[in-house]
């Protein structure tokens, strides 16, 4: 079995590697404002700009728990949002060039890119000191859906440059005195 | 699918080291702390400590303090556990497990039997 | 270290039975309690942490509970796969340990 997503107790879901991440809505989590890899966003359409379209990537900053402890420090993640739509041209089946139009195949906002980040834990009671290892999504990017496909086999939008490993998981732990540093971000 | 294939049995003589293997597949290693945990014959589980592959950092039991240390090659998923001046009492079966934390232990290796005999 | 004491050490049921097992901390560990189940020959495999957290794909018959010093794995309905051994382990303080084991029989 591999890893699934994670309910560390009744108040979040931590997502499972090889899952895409939808975290819940929480108190102490704050949106951002969307990001296109520091791009404005652009509508998936827009005939001027022949650049590959990306969709957008929300920023959300929250503090994970595990049982009745809680991070540290609050993490930032991304979810990966928005419509995905072609902004560049693509050959038909003649030769031609032409854009996708809204009826043709369906595009999906997912993720990209991953990294791992290392929790520092807070417990109750003067417990050891605890760690745990998180995946969070990087960056986020569209993937086309054919009809001759069902729904989850995605198609690459484009070229990509890294592709998240698949069937793998996270999840966290308790932390070494010789650690000091609190968090470890590592794109992957 | 996560999985952790560990090194075939070993005999040691006392006073000897030994290194199993653990090669980890369905996720990356460096994504997960690595715990080491050991049986002895119809005994109960010790846990022996754990690692963390990314930056290296390790936490061992008292016990096995200056005896064990954890590696890992990240480049090829495998974990590493080596303990040194080996006794009789050092015979038992010797658990690979993973996690996303420091102190539970998600998935388990097969095990490896290692015997101390002179 | 924090010592766990199990109870009992073996005990013999039958299919379908409620079966309860104790784990007793030497200190208080607060929540930080997990259960594992062993078959002969085979490695542990978790089953609740957080003292009362089910890890994934763990059948909804086991179920435990407790806080400070007392905890408690019940099997709501042993199952002819549910024979073996189970262990709670501690990580409130270093170093992790775990209770001597509690061995669940066919009667």
């Known amino acids: 079995q591999g890893w699934q997503a994670f309910r560390n107790d009744a108040t979040e879901v931590i997502p499972g590697l090889g899952e895409y991440p939808e975290p819940p809505p929480e108190n102490n989590q704050t949106m951002n404002r969307a990001e296109n890899g520091g791009r404005p966003p652009h509508h998936p359409y827009d005939a001027k700009d022949v650049s590959e379209y990306s969709c957008r990537e929300l920023h959300y900053t929250r503090f994970l728990t595990d049982g009745p402890c809680r991070s540290a420090k609050p993490v930032t993640e991304l979810v990966c949002s928005g419509q995905c739509g072609p902004a560049r041209l693509l050959p038909n089946a003649i030769g031609r060039v032409k854009w996708w139009r809204p009826n043709g195949p369906d595009f999906r906002c997912i993720p990209d890119r991953y990294r791992a980040q290392r929790v520092q834990l807070l417990c109750p009671g003067g417990a050891a000191p605890r760690s745990r290892k998180v995946r969070l999504v990087a960056s986020c990017k569209c993937k086309r859906l054919t009809r001759f496909h069902n729904q989850s086999e995605l198609k690459d939008f484009g070229p990509e440059t890294a592709r998240p490993q698949k069937g793998r998981k996270p999840r966290p732990g308790a932390r070494g005195a010789k650690a000091n540093q609190a968090e470890l971000e590592n794109a992957y | 699918q996560v999985q952790l294939v560990q090194s075939g049995a070993e005999v040691k003589k006392p006073g000897a080291s030994v290194k199993v293997s653990c090669k980890v597949s369905?996720?990356?290693?460096?994504?997960?702390?690595q715990h080491w945990v050991r049986q002895a014959p119809g005994k109960g589980l010790e846990w022996m400590g754990w690692?963390?592959?990314?930056?290296?950092?390790?936490e061992y039991a008292s016990k096995f303090q200056g005896r064990v240390t954890m590696t890992e090659d990240t480049s090829t998923d495998t974990a590493y556990m080596e303990l040194s001046s080996l006794r009789s009492e050092d015979t038992a079966v010797y658990y690979c497990?993973?996690?996303?934390?420091?102190?539970?232990?998600?998935?388990w290796g097969q095990g490896t039997t290692v015997t101390v005999s002179s | 270290d924090i010592q766990m004491t199990q109870s009992p050490s073996s005990l013999s049921a039958s299919v379908g039975d409620r079966v309860t097992i104790t784990c007793k901390a030497s200190?208080?560990?607060?929540?930080?309690v997990a259960w594992y189940q062993q078959k002969p020959g085979k490695a542990p495999k978790l089953l609740i942490y957080?003292?009362?957290t089910r890890w994934t794909g763990v059948p909804s018959r086991f179920s435990g509970s407790g806080s400070g010093t007392d905890f408690t794995l019940t099997i709501s309905s042993l199952q002819p796969e549910d024979f073996a051994t189970y262990y709670c382990?501690?990580?409130?303080?270093?170093?992790?340990?775990f209770g001597g084991g509690t061995k669940v029989e066919i009667k």
């Open positions: 497990a993973t996690g996303d934390t420091t102190y539970k232990f998600d998935f």
């Open positions: 369905g996720f990356p290693i460096k994504h997960h702390f």
């Open positions: 690692s963390d592959p990314e930056i290296g950092d390790t």
């Open positions: 200190q208080d560990v607060h929540t930080a």
């Open positions: 957080w003292a009362s």
């Open positions: 382990q501690q990580y409130s303080d270093y170093h992790w340990t």
